[in-house]
Amino acid sequence: AGVFELQIHSFGPGPGPGAPRSPCSARLPCRLFFRVCLKPGLSEEAAESPCALGAALSARGPVYTEQPGAPAPDLPLPDGLLQVPFRDAWPGTFSFIIETWREELGDQIGGPAWSLLARVAGRRRLAAGGPWARDIQRAGAWELRFSYRARCEPPAVGTACTRLCRPRSAPSRCGPGLRPCAPLEDECEAPLVCRAGCSPEHGFCEQPGECRCLEGWTGPLCTVPVSTSSCLSPRGPSSATTGCLVPGPGPCDGNPCANGGSCSETPRSFECTCPRGFYGLRCEVSGVTCADGPCFNGGLCVGGADPDSAYICHCPPGFQGSNCEKRVDRCSLQPCRNGGLCLDLGHALRCRCRAGFAGPRCEHDLDDCAGRACANGGTCVEGGGAHRCSCALGFGGRDCRERADPCAARPCAHGGRCYAHFSGLVCACAPGYMGARCEFPVHPDGASALPAAPPGLRPGDPQRYL
């Protein structure tokens, strides 16, 4: 036994565009309350009932009146926890539905009017005794933030609240075969007293006085093997006293699960995993139909016209889950090729392509130079999804349309003066230097560090750089 506890942190508009209108107004003040419904197992249904693990209703929140013109803020919440007691073991996996209800406090005839504002559903794994788990769920434009936990009620302990604890009889340690009840180290695990004579090897009990048999054993005390004939394909353990077990009729033979449920054998007997919309030991009970509106975010409910048939939600693009309750991060699949940037716009997926690529998914590699003329005799060079022009002497810029200033980089060394020329640049060297860029000193004795100047050029003459 134990208690499932739910703490609502906030309920208000979710992120993104399309903020919802405030549910309350000056003309129609209202207050919120919450309902939680729990069911065992990872059933894929979002039924309003039955809530096999239990259900709870919160207190009413403070009265809220919208401020005219203000966006809907996080709405005032009821105080305290929602608590759902469970009598048996905690199942470890559970389905939940949390509904946000509005109570209108206007002058309604016959008392306040209630309407469902939002409903979120999900399936979770949770060990009893663990810390609070935090969650955020969205329903349309609303966002609900909450925490939950399951805790055992003494004397039960453990992740399923199935172990029982008793105060220690001896001060120092627990009895033989019994463990301390962490975190209650001063208590000891209490043995369950099964039915007298229940086989310790082949029987067990979850409640005092019962005797349940492991697979392959039967009888009131679980001492009779299902079959002791030959030893073909044993189903269970063998022993010298009982011989080998052969497949007797297994608990799943003939599939006891109705409505398309799948059967799995358990130590006790069998367990049915039910399709969405069904529950019960043999999936014989239908919980939710299309009339309950189980599909969120524009999902279409298919089937489930009556309580005997399951429903399926066909989800619009961008949503998934048995109730279309989960938003798909479509960009996580990296649909944009060649380094394109993925944008999930909600109504569509867009790829913003890098230069040189095109197409809905940037799948087309453009010919970078196609239709790209480089001016003034420049030549186009492809590379990395972008074109580049290799410009003729005296021209520059992306398309070689700009006349280059050859002197901009100060190419003349040692204080030489630079002159732009139709075919490039000319350096007028300072006294004592020579060369196309005035890079070579002239020796004081008249000889230079270079071979003799070409005929017709004296050291110190402007050297034209061709």
Partner: antibody
Framework: QVQLQESGPGLVKPSETLSLTCTVS????????WSWIRQPPGKGLEWIGY???????NYYPSLKSRVTISIDTSKNQFSLKLSSVTAADTAVYYC????????????WGQGTLVTVSS | EIVLTQSPGTLSLSPGERATLSCRAS???????LAWYQQKPGQAPRLLIY???SRATGIPDRFSGSGSGTDFTLTISRLEPEDFAVYYC?????????FGGGTKLEIK
């Protein structure tokens, strides 16, 4: 701007199969549901069925045994086949795109009249 | 299936007047999953309203939708000559998708 264009024979003989194709231009057929709707002369609109780009289908129950909707994403087309037609199947047939906000129709083809007659 | 009944079958009004078209569902339409379309002779229907009250892109604000549960209304606040057409409602809460029989809005 998404555009849809129906194509196929305008005259079909009773008991034969009506075949229509819808070509989608101005957008990808992927990531959407696509539907067929018909309108008998002088009457209202009747939903026939839809297909998702993944191939998932859903049909109007009374037509289910006779309808097949298929999709060819490489050609940006989806098709309708309606078998064993009778005069009651004479109608203007529309193809349409289902919106992302829910299962309503935001883009329609201009429609094509199919007459069932011998 | 959800049966949608539109009324009146024909509505005769003059330009400038207010038009109120009704769509009633045989079962409650969850989450207001209801759309309205306009169809002119020889043309395909055009989406006007979805979610019972949200206007589709490019639809003038003289068109408005309201209602919930089983009763929905399309209102045209001030009729323009181009508004005279047939109007259909459609539910998309559950399969099969169904349309109303239509309301013909004609010039008086």
């Amino acid at each position: 701007q998404v555009q849809l264009q129906e194509s196929g024979p305008g005259l079909v003989k009773p008991s034969e199969t009506l075949s229509l194709t819808c070509t989608v231009s101005g957008g990808s057929i992927s990531s959407y549901y696509w539907s067929w709707i018909r309108q008998p002369p002088g009457k209202g609109l009747e939903w026939i069925g839809y297909i998702y780009y993944s191939g998932r289908t859903n049909y109007y129950p009374s037509l289910k045994s006779r309808v097949t909707i298929s999709i060819d994403t490489s050609k940006n087309q989806f098709s309708l086949k309606l078998s064993s037609v009778t005069a009651a199947d004479t109608a203007v047939y529309y193809c349409a795109r289902i919106a992302v906000a829910g299962f309503f129709f935001d883009y329609w083809g201009q429609g094509t009249l199919v007459t069932v007659s011998s | 299936e959800i049966v949608l009944t539109q009324s009146p079958g024909t509505l005769s009004l003059s330009p400038g007047e207010r038009a109120t078209l009704s769509c009633r569902a045989s079962q409650s339409v969850n989450k207001n999953y209801l759309a309205w379309y306009q169809q002119k002779p020889g043309q395909a229907p055009r989406l006007l309203i979805y979610g019972a009250s949200s206007r589709a892109t490019g639809i003038p604000d003289r068109f408005s939708g309201s209602g919930s549960g089983t009763d929905f209304t399309l209102t045209i606040s001030r009729l323009e000559p181009e508004d005279f057409a047939v109007y259909y409602c459609q539910q998309y809460d559950r399969s099969p998708l169904t349309f109303g029989g239509g309301t013909k809005l004609e010039i008086k």
